[in-house]
């Protein structure tokens, strides 16, 4: 039994970190693997982490953690039994994956303005709450071509955009994600969809 | 309530030896690991020794290795010092304290302190 | 072995004004967590900061830490009465916990 791609490892910079890796064969991840993780930090204790199957060779992990900070380091171990297959280590801070906003919604109700609103995914002590920037992707139903991203540089977790600038009668989805550029993070994972039926009034021609 | 409680501390001998306990309440022992600070008279805090949650990894400053040898009972919540071949400058309060992962090292809860005195 | 240097060693200001303490590291410390403390004349050591800048639970928010690398500061943005005493940082790292002499914050 062989590690044929090594562990990778993102963290929520909060509580979980995901590990993947695969092996060189078709491996049932639970029963055959676990993966040791041990916080670099005088008298830690280690913990042990029961991975599961993704795909035929491929395994993941989720390590829980007590919070995150920037100099946290961890050593890694992956055994079989016995055999220890694969050494390594992982500093949270240099591979964060936010989690995703929560919550979208969007108003309609603002004269002829959507307001769309999210909830960020970090409570207020956590650093991240303060330092995530997001993207709104729009799209319709009805027209493939119809699909647009909105870029939010700001910290509320709020896009206002003119009804008109979305055809009128028709159905649009929104989702949003977000990033972090003090950890140079990747993107989170996209947020559920929601659904509105976009109307406004079309302004009377001036003649 | 979170408390610690220490005793065992007393007047000595140099040479001779001594064992503090400390008590834990109001928290599981066997969750954290714990340590023990000194701090002489009239001067600041100095790290002694320190024991992981289960008891299976020890730490020592160089100023008492091979002389002090930490331990814990988890099971009755309590950390133990024994210590030997006392000299004048081990002369100090003891604290016994708790360290949180959550909290990288920082020692979240600290006891009153035993006093040890080393003079002939 | 790494040394914690803190400085002034005494720290005279009035109650309301802003106090800047101190802590330096002998080597980069980036791999492992300053903490700070307070303690009172015949009293046990309080944690107030960890991981460098992080609070600990019910202190208030002028209590502020900051640093990295090998210069570390303790800010009291307001002084209260309370807040005299004399101030400890100290690191703990994957094989050794140190630290610094100390910092007396007296009034003025």
């Known amino acids: 039994m062989k590690v044929l791609q090594e562990p990778t490892c993102v963290s929520d910079y909060m509580s979980i970190s995901t590990c993947e890796w695969k092996m060189n064969g078709p491996t049932n991840c639970s029963t055959e693997l676990r993966l040791l993780y041990q916080l670099v930090f005088l008298l830690s204790e280690a913990h042990t982490c029961i991975p599961e199957n993704n795909g035929g060779a491929g395994c993941v992990c989720h390590l829980l953690m007590d919070d995150v900070v920037s100099a946290d380091n961890y050593t890694l171990d992956l055994w079989a039994g016995q055999q220890l297959l694969w050494k390594g280590s992982f500093k949270p801070s240099e591979h964060v994956k936010p989690r995703a906003p929560g919550n979208l919604t969007v108003h309609t109700n603002v004269s002829d303005t959507l307001l769309l609103t999210w909830s960020n995914p970090y409570p207020p002590d956590n650093y991240l709450y303060n330092h995530l920037t997001y993207a709104v992707n729009i799209w319709s139903e009805n027209d493939p071509a119809d699909f647009r991203i909105y870029n939010v540089t700001y910290l509320e977790p709020s896009l206002r955009i003119a009804a008109s600038t979305l055809k009128s009668g028709i159905s649009y989805r929104a989702r949003v994600r977000a990033w972090a550029q003090c950890y140079n993070t990747t993107w989170s994972e996209w947020s559920p969809s929601t659904k509105w039926h976009n109307s406004y009034r079309e302004p009377f021609e001036q003649h | 309530e979170v408390q610690l409680l220490e005793s065992g501390g007393g007047l000595v001998q140099p040479g001779g030896s001594l064992r503090l306990s400390c008590a834990a309440s109001?928290?599981?022992?066997?969750?954290?690991?714990m340590h023990w600070v000194r701090q002489a008279p009239g001067k600041g805090l100095e790290y002694v020794s320190g024991?992981?949650?289960?008891?299976?990894?020890?730490y020592y400053a160089n100023s008492v290795k091979g002389r002090f040898t930490i331990s814990r009972d988890n099971p009755k919540n309590t950390l133990f010092l024994q210590m030997s071949s006392l000299r004048a400058e081990d002369t100090a309060v003891y604290y016994c304290?708790?360290?949180?992962?959550?909290?990288?090292?920082?020692?979240?809860?600290w006891g009153q302190g035993t006093t040890v005195t080393v003079s002939s | 072995e790494i040394v914690l240097t803190q400085s002034p060693g005494t720290l005279s200001l009035s109650p309301g004004e802003r106090a800047t303490l101190s802590c330096r590291a002998s080597?980069?410390?980036?791999?492992?967590?300053l903490a700070w403390y307070q303690q009172k004349p015949g009293q046990a050591p309080r944690l107030l900061i960890y991981?460098?800048?992080r609070r600990a639970t019910g202190i208030p928010d002028r209590f502020s830490g900051s640093g990295s690398g090998t210069d570390f500061t303790l800010t009291i943005s307001r002084l209260e009465p309370e807040d005299f005493a004399v101030y400890y940082c100290?690191?703990?790292?994957?094989?050794?916990?140190?630290f610094g002499q100390g910092t007396k914050l007296e009034i003025k």
């Open positions: 080597q980069d410390v980036s791999s492992a967590y």
């Open positions: 100290q690191l703990y790292g994957a094989t050794s916990v140190t």
């Open positions: 304290v708790r360290v949180r992962v959550l909290y990288r090292g920082g020692m979240d809860v």
């Open positions: 024991i992981s949650h289960s008891g299976t990894s020890t």
């Open positions: 109001g928290f599981t022992l066997s969750s954290y690991a």
């Open positions: 991981g460098t800048s």
